[in-house]
């Protein structure tokens, strides 16, 4: 043999119970001591430090802390140094060294030692990762190193978590003993944070110890808080909230059309939209993700805004008799009431549509003029004016005439035409044609589609000539002999030629 000792490097005991520290030692056979003595020291192996004597086989003298509480269970002659400590209290926690005393100069303190830990709670061992939906084994372990008092285990707060299975007394690697009870169950997300307890009691004593472990159940996110569809007025502030329940907290991401708008590891994430525009109208998605899974939900944002200024497309110039088609369109939310007016008269209207088609079959000159397309919803009204130009051959109006006054004859030729006609006055009796370009004789004035040309003849009062007005444009020409109005006409009627 050789000098050596074997004892557990650590051992535990419940406060108030006892602990048996298993210990064996060896020494060279040739020493052949008649009697083997031994000493157990507390916390220091150096006798010079005067460590508390826990047990000494040669005498009954021990440190006051160990008085009546220490006893050798082993037989030193059989190289067994097992120590029993009774009614252990926290101050007994520490290192225990054995010193063999074989007589003569052969006292040997073994460097191997045992660290005693005085505990008052059972040790609940939960696997490092507990995932919802996956079976888990939770164990309750308590030291069982007191031959006089054996612990009994029971679970607390395990209702609905399955029936415990008692494994019983198990020997650990270094010769210490534990009492073990197992609990098998499939945790749910609701079990997260649940306090599971284990109680160790000692029959025929009042000793009772409880330990608790909070379940840290990992589970995938579920989005639990989300706006329903949101309506917002253009320019207003919009907050979209997404809240998820998961463990660990999820990575929350707000997205729109595949673009990440905001993300954070949090239980809830607010997406703030300042002064929303119609461009931000659409579907927003919240994605919640952790290592155990993901969830996503969408919310529609509807940005409400007044109609944009309508745009008008179509034929703005038409020939009399043609069919004209004009499209008025706008954008708004909600869709507007669209109306086309002409001179305060409603020509066409649609409700909650973004475009309005105006059909004018066989347009006439009366259709020529200014039109308005008006778009309106509860947020506002916008209008666009447009002109329809109806082109037609000249029409000489009935108010065309000649009139004499003293020595002057004035002839009015009133023409309605589009485009503007060229007007000529013909005096057949004189074989003369006067064009509107001859400013000293002709004055023209246009009002809308009506052109009034005035021919002034001086010194013609006594014998007014025949005057023929001809109006011409690309669609045709019309002529009219202008009638004389007033006294001369009547006079002529009396006198005759």
């Amino acid at each position: 043999g050789h000098w050596g000792a074997w004892m557990p490097s650590s051992i535990s005991a419940f406060e108030g119970t006892c602990v048996s520290i298993p210990c064996r030692f060896d020494f060279p056979d040739e020493l052949r001591p008649a009697v083997v003595h031994g000493v157990w020291y507390f916390n220091s192996p150096y006798p010079k430090n005067y460590p508390p004597v826990v047990f000494k086989s040669r005498t009954q003298v021990v440190h006051e802390s160990f008085q009546g509480r220490s006893r050798l269970l082993g037989d030193l002659g059989l190289r067994n140094c097992t120590l029993l400590l009774s009614n252990v209290s926290p101050e007994l926690g520490g290192k225990y060294y054995f010193r063999g005393d074989l007589g003569g100069y052969n006292q040997y303190t073994f460097s191997e030692h045992s660290v005693l830990d005085i505990v008052n709670t059972p040790n609940i061992v939960v696997p490092p990762e507990v995932v919802a939906g996956t079976e888990v084994e939770v164990s309750c372990m308590v030291p069982d190193n007191c031959p006089e008092l054996r612990p009994e285990l029971s679970w607390l707060g395990h209702e609905g978590l399955g029936e415990p299975a008692v494994l019983g007394r198990l020997r650990e690697d270094e010769g210490t003993w534990v009492q073990v009870s197992l609990l098998h169950f499939v945790p749910t997300r609701e079990a997260n944070g649940h306090r599971l307890g284990c109680q160790a009691s000692f029959p025929n004593t009042t000793l009772q110890f409880e330990g608790y472990a909070s379940m840290d159940v990992k589970y995938p996110p579920v989005i639990v808080e989300m706006n329903s569809s949101v309506e917002a007025i253009e320019g207003s502030h919009v907050s979209l909230l997404c809240g998820a329940d998961s463990n660990p907290p999820p990575l929350l991401t707000w997205m729109r059309d595949g673009t990440v708008l905001r993300e954070a590891v949090a239980e809830s994430l607010l997406l703030e939209l300042e002064e929303v525009t119609p461009a931000e109208d659409g579907v927003y998605a919240c994605l919640a993700e952790n290592a155990y899974g993901q969830d996503n939900r969408t919310v529609g944002l509807s940005v409400m805004y007044a109609p944009w200024k309508p745009t008008v497309n179509g034929t703005m110039v038409a020939v009399e008799g043609e069919t004209v088609s004009i499209l008025c369109s706008t954008q708004s939310n909600p869709d507007p009431i669209l109306t086309i007016f002409k001179e305060k008269q409603i020509l066409s209207t649609v409700i909650y549509e973004s475009e309005l088609q105006l059909e004018l079959p066989a347009v006439s000159p009366e259709d020529d003029g200014e039109y308005w397309c008006v778009a309106e919803n509860q947020y506002g009204q916008r209008a666009t004016a447009f002109n329809l130009s109806v082109e037609f051959a000249p029409v000489l109006l009935l108010e065309s005439h000649c009139a004499a006054a003293r020595d002057t004859v004035q002839c009015l030729c009133v023409v309605k035409s589009n485009p503007e006609p060229s007007v000529a006055f013909e005096l057949p009796s004189r074989n003369v044609t006067v064009n509107e370009s001859e400013r000293e004789f002709v004055y023209s004035e246009r009002s809308g589609l009506v052109l009034t040309s005035i021919l002034t003849l001086r010194g013609q009062a006594q014998a007014p000539p025949r005057v023929i007005c001809t109006a011409r444009n690309l669609y045709g020409a019309k002529s009219l002999e202008l009638p004389f109005q007033g006294a001369h006409r009547l006079m002529w009627a009396k006198i005759g030629p």
């Epitope: 000098w3 060279p28 020493l31 001591p33 008649a34 006798p47 010079k48 003569g104 100069y105």
Partner: antibody
Framework: QVQLVQSGSELKKPGASVKVSCKAS????????MNWVRQAPGQGLEWMGW????????TYADDFTGRFVFSLDTSVSTAYLQISSLKAEDTAVYYC???????????????????WGQGTLVTVSS | DIVMTQSPDSLAVSLGERATINCKSS????????????LAWYQQKPGQPPKLLIY???TRESGVPDRFSGSGSGTDFTLTIINLQAEDVAVYYC????????FGQGTKLEIK
């Protein structure tokens, strides 16, 4: 030179106590253990035990437990043997003897007794 | 305890002659860890304390005449004194210091 000088002879009555001293000089006191050896008149040598002068820890031979106490006063390099409840059979010459000690870590090895005191005769008689 | 037995109990040798004293231990005093025999020889003259002559069974203490020698191993040991001198008259003790220390009963050496 190494010297171990013991206190003088003692005549004691049975039941009394006696304290024998052994003063060391010429070496470092705490580097050597101090042994006590008894020699009854006309008899052989009997080892009583020793005291570790470095740690102050005494070790007693099996026949010398109880009434026999080894002690030290390292400040004056002196070892003491105290015998209480003296009996007639305690009459003997008591020797102190040093032994070298080789220290290593928390343990040591003890060697042969090399220097002895001159002895102290303790007579127990009524 | 290890019992040490010396022989003879007494011995008379002429001056200048050789004296041999034997010592037997009840168990080996050879320590396996260092292969040393934990055995010593002492000389004690009347009225004096014992004096160390030999240790480790064969190592002479400084100042001891080389007429003294020790031998043996395990359980059997011998002290030899050659060219015996008058001052060698004494009681000789063997002593083991491996386990709880013990002495032999002593051998008385006289001049013949």
């Amino acid at each position: 030179q190494v010297q171990l000088v013991q206190s003088g002879s003692e005549l004691k009555k049975p039941g009394a106590s006696v304290k024998v001293s052994c003063k060391a000089s010429g070496y470092t006191f705490t580097n050597y253990g101090m042994n006590w050896v008894r020699q009854a008149p006309g008899q052989g040598l009997e080892w009583m035990g020793w005291i570790n002068t470095y740690t102050g820890e005494p070790t007693y031979a099996d026949d010398f437990t109880g009434r026999f106490v080894f002690s030290l006063d390292t400040s004056v390099s002196t070892a003491y043997l105290q015998i209480s409840s003296l009996k007639a059979e305690d009459t003997a010459v008591y020797y102190c003897a040093r032994n070298p000690i080789n220290y290593y870590g928390i343990n040591y090895e003890g060697y042969v007794m090399d220097y002895w005191g001159q002895g102290t005769l303790v007579t127990v008689s009524s | 305890d290890i019992v040490m037995t010396q022989s003879p109990d007494s011995l008379a040798v002429s001056l200048g002659e050789r004296a041999t004293i034997n010592c037997k231990s009840s168990h080996s005093v050879l320590y396996s860890s260092n292969q040393k025999n934990y055995l010593a020889w002492y000389q004690q003259k009347p009225g004096q304390p014992p004096k160390l002559l030999i240790y480790w069974a064969s190592t002479r203490e400084s100042g001891v005449p080389d007429r003294f020698s020790g031998s043996g191993s395990g359980t059997d040991f011998t002290l030899t004194i050659i060219n015996l001198q008058a001052e060698d008259v004494a009681v000789y003790y063997c002593h083991q210091y491996l386990s709880s220390l013990t002495f032999g009963q002593g051998t008385k050496l006289e001049i013949k």
